[in-house]
């Protein structure tokens, strides 16, 4: 029977007693940064080329003996994984394997730099079709390995990291923080965060999505023939990259931002138990576990967005923190949080000629997080109009005045310490859905684009008193593109995009002695685009 | 996934005023930094990735190395230039003494440098 | 192009070893071990065992194990297979072929075991 | 006694389509992706027609398909040839050898 894991990756219609979708990633090279491996292993011959790099530290011990199984068990295992016959996800795809790793699975910075340079110049001497690095392996934060990762990227290959095994942040590790890498955390059969004796998988804002990391069955170095069950990150991120290698060879020209925003999307989301997250990472871990499209094809009229989160801002008075889309992504929305609730909102602003989203601290807060929302927007041409503090009326307004422009996302940033003082604002007059409403003594900004066939609209959910989170979701076939709160109020610790769910968190109103007139609102801007709908069905 | 996490240790060394028998001065103002593992067992003292700015050449990486190799021997110091970068990122990979980690920041061209250290197998 | 070549038709007695080679060119060899395969005259294929240019080790049949025995020698991309004790049932065409995919045979070697 | 069971001979005329079956058991061609099927002239070596169950190397013709159910493998031969006269076999992956089948004498009437 199919083993588990590839069952949990399989969308329904794919699903006989056997797994075996189509095209297995035949138009797709996959580099394996690794151990060296056994490549003709039965699962695995004749679809791995084991390329002459080797640049690895000698073993430690005086008494190491050097058994040549357990050189090869790690990376044979994760070819297997991506590529093999009867266990791997990309049954199509060839693979290159460049040994980084010694026979105790350790390796260098540096040797796995220079393996990326090896891979960066074969692909100039010999362009191929798309590109797919592994690095199953992870260090310490590291500057030089994630800048080397960002240049790769930028080169047009995808690279795919595990996030770790360490039960711990992955943005303290290499190359899992490199904001370009496709970082994956381990979930098992039951869709839990993986266990790895005292530890387990790495979490937080750097981890892109989850993919099944334990017992995952395939090939043994300890035989021709043999299977093993192995458990890790790097078993989730060998996942990733063979689904990443099916999609590229249905599709050979996505960008790598496209190739992510796809791999989000088809996701099983909310799946995950988040109880076994350190309770402040539960809202920066992404709860997706990836999953193949459910047809190779087609998925080019969907509106993708993501939901990106800054690094913490820190406590101090004037903090602030930035979260940054891609760089063929759109800013189209811009929110905060704080878990004190002491914040100054936030701001888009143009930083080196793209947008950026900025979060403000507060005196006494603990500190910000800039919650960005990215998006695929071919065509678009968006900027930001803002408003000054209305001081004296009801409420600041801003809206999209330029012809053919559609608000995409709202953000209020204030300089007063503490709205919660003043006066709350108006709520927004019906009818005016190309415009942003917030407190007088706040600046409003509205991000506002102009795209082919873009249309978007304002849905609100709003209860009377505070509950801890209010939320309001978009239909099928539209996308949240922005996320706010209405009130800015003090008791509200900010909104944030989960998915396709707009989320304001406030502090529980037994807790903050607010009065039930203080309604708090959520509101998304849920937008489509006719024109990729439009496009898709000419190509179909 | 951001650059900008803090969390690992940063040494920023201020490029002092001394020419040290430089025959190109860095630019006025810049300062190149220094970096290494937070995780002190991770940590592989005596090899260094010496990254340079963006647009530096080839030759001109050489040069740097060479450079450094003969500041390093006039000083006393033996180094071993162990690999040129290019086609990702400009520089090289040494092994010296950490003593000379401060003549090193000091070169032209120099961004920053980063102690090596250990990748593990997930 | 990719070939494998092997050696010469042999006959042999009964009781006697018979060693016979197969040489690979044309692709990479550690990405594939060699497969050998025998066919007795009219009848089916025999899967006899394999062996791994990688590392030389290697997986035998469970009909022939303790009889036969398969070697490398990486220096002449060349394999071999010895099958001892040999009994009249063992005449055969005796093949390799590359990898457990089977993908390329080599001509055949026609061993004739008879008293 | 081979692993696989295959018919002993099946015929067609020209520009036909026949098929040969390969049954097993899920020890072999029913838990395996690794169904593979040859084709072997009088006094040559075989020749690999269909890969993996279904794939065809470059070179093979597309006349030439493989599928598989359960435990059952077929290949699937259309607008028959004079030369597509020979004997084909199956094999399969078991957990740790290979098998084949007794092989199949296909005629072109």
């Known amino acids: 029977s199919i083993p588990w894991n590839l069952e949990r990756i399989t969308p329904p219609r794919y699903r006989a007693d056997e797994y075996q979708p189509p095209d297995g990633g035949s138009l797709v090279e996959v580099y394996l940064l690794d151990t060296s491996i056994q490549s003709d292993h039965r699962e695995i011959e004749g679809r791995v080329m084991v390329t002459d790099f080797e640049n690895v530290p000698e073993e430690d011990g005086t008494r190491f003996h050097r058994q040549a199984s357990k050189c090869d068990s790690h990376g044979t295992h994760l070819a297997g994984v991506v590529s093999g016959r009867d266990a791997g996800v990309a049954k199509g795809a060839s693979m290159r394997s460049l040994r980084v790793l010694n026979c105790q699975g350790k390796g260098t910075v540096s040797g796995t730099l220079i393996g990326l340079e090896f891979i960066r110049k074969s692909q100039l001497v010999q362009p191929v079709g798309p590109l797919v690095v592994l690095l199953p392996l992870a260090g310490g934060y590291s500057r030089v390995l994630n800048a080397a990762c960002q240049r790769l990227a930028r080169a047009g290959v995808v690279l795919v990291t595990a996030a770790g095994n360490f039960r711990d942040d992955a943005c303290l590790y290499s190359p899992a923080s490199a904001p370009e890498v496709i970082t994956v955390g381990a979930t098992n059969a039951q869709d839990q965060p993986v266990t790895l004796g005292t530890l387990g998988t790495n979490f937080g804002r750097c981890v892109d999505l989850f993919a099944p990391g334990e017992d995952i069955i395939g090939a043994s170095s300890d035989c021709s023939t043999c299977f093993v069950s192995q458990s890790g990150t790097s078993q989730a991120a060998a996942h990733v990259a063979g689904i990443a290698a099916m999609m590229l060879s249905a599709e050979p020209e996505l960008t790598l931002a496209e190739l992510r925003q796809r791999l989000i999307h088809f996701s099983a989301k909310d799946v995950i138990n988040e109880a076994w997250f350190p309770e402040d990472q539960r809202v920066l871990t992404p709860n997706l576990v990836a999953a193949l499209p459910p047809s190779t094809h087609g998925a080019g009229w969907q509106l993708f967005c993501r939901t990106v989160w800054s690094a913490h801002s820190g406590p101090t008075r004037m903090a602030t923190a930035i979260a940054r889309c891609a760089p063929d992504e759109e800013l189209l929305s811009c929110s905060s949080f704080s878990r004190s609730g002491k914040r100054r909102g936030e701001r888009m602003e143009a930083q080196g000629g793209k947008l950026v989203c900025r979060a403000h601290n507060a005196f006494g807060g603990e500190g910000v997080y800039a919650i960005a929302r990215c998006c695929l927007l071919p065509q678009a041409n968006c900027s930001v109009h803002t408003a000054p503090p209305a001081e004296a009326s009801m409420g600041t307004r801003v809206h999209c005045h330029q012809q053919g422009h559609v608000l995409t996302g709202c953000s209020s940033h204030w300089e007063v310490e503490d709205l919660g003082t003043h006066k709350p604002p108006v709520l927004r007059p019906r009818g005016q859905p190309n415009q942003c409403v917030g407190h007088r003594e706040a600046s409003i900004h509205a991000s506002c684009c102009h795209a082919p066939g873009l249309e978007c609209k304002v849905k609100e959910h709003g209860i009377p008193a505070p509950q801890g989170q209010v939320t309001v979701a978009c239909e099928e076939g539209w996308t949240l593109t922005g996320c706010s709160a209405l009130p800015g109020t003090s008791h509200v610790l900010g909104a944030y995009a989960v998915d396709n769910t707009c989320v304001v968190r406030s502090r529980d109103v037994s807790t903050t002695g607010s009065t039930s007139e203080e309604a708090v609102t959520a509101v998304a801007i849920c937008c489509r685009s006719r024109h990729l709908a439009q496009a898709s069905q000419e190509l179909q | 996934q951001e650059d900008e996490d803090g969390d690992y240790e940063e040494l920023v060394l201020a490029l002092r005023s001394e020419e040290d028998g430089l025959a190109e001065a860095p630019e006025h103002g810049t300062t190149a930094t220094f970096h290494r593992c937070a995780k002190d067992p991770w940590r592989l003292p005596g090899t260094y990735v010496v990254v340079l700015k963006e647009e530096t050449h080839l030759s001109q990486s050489e040069r740097t190395a060479r450079r450094l190799q003969a500041q390093a021997a006039r000083r006393g110091y033996l180094t071993k230039i162990l690999h040129v970068f290019h086609g990702l990122l400009p520089g090289f990979l040494v092994k010296m003494s950490g003593d000379l980690l401060e003549l090193a920041l000091k070169l032209p061209h120099v961004d920053y440098i980063e102690e090596d250290s250990s990748v593990f197998a997930q | 192009q990719i070939q494998l070549v092997q050696s010469g038709a042999e006959v042999k007695k009964p009781g006697a070893s018979v060693k016979v080679s197969c040489k690979a060119s044309g692709y990479t060899l550690t990405s594939y071990g060699i497969s050998w395969v025998r066919q007795a005259p009219g009848q089916g294929l025999e899967w006899m065992g394999w062996?791994?240019?990688?590392?030389?080790?290697?997986n035998y049949a469970q009909k022939v194990q303790g009889r036969v025995t398969m070697t490398t020698d990486t220096s002449t991309s060349t394999v071999y297979m010895e099958l001892r004790s040999l009994r009249s049932d063992d005449t055969a065409v005796y093949f390799c072929?590359?990898?457990?995919?089977?993908?390329?045979w080599g001509q055949g070697t026609t061993v004739t075991v008879s008293s | 006694q081979s692993a696989l069971t295959q018919p002993a001979s099946v015929s067609g005329s020209p520009g036909q389509s026949i098929t040969i079956s390969c049954t097993g058991t899920?020890?072999?061609?029913?838990?395996?992706?690794?169904v593979s099927w040859y084709q072997q002239h009088p006094g040559k070596p075989p020749k690999l027609m269909i890969y993996?169950?279904?794939n065809r190397p470059s070179g093979v013709s597309n006349r030439f398909s493989g599928s598989k159910s359960g435990n059952t493998a077929s290949l699937t031969i259309s607008g028959l040839q004079a030369e597509d006269e020979a004997d084909y076999f199956c094999s399969s992956y078991t957990s740790t050898s290979m098998v084949f089948g007794g092989g199949t004498k296909l005629a072109v009437l």
């Open positions: 062996i791994s240019f990688y590392n030389g080790n290697t």
């Open positions: 993996e169950v279904s």
């Open positions: 899920s020890s072999d061609v029913g838990g395996y992706n690794s």
């Open positions: 072929a590359r990898g457990y995919g089977m993908d390329v």
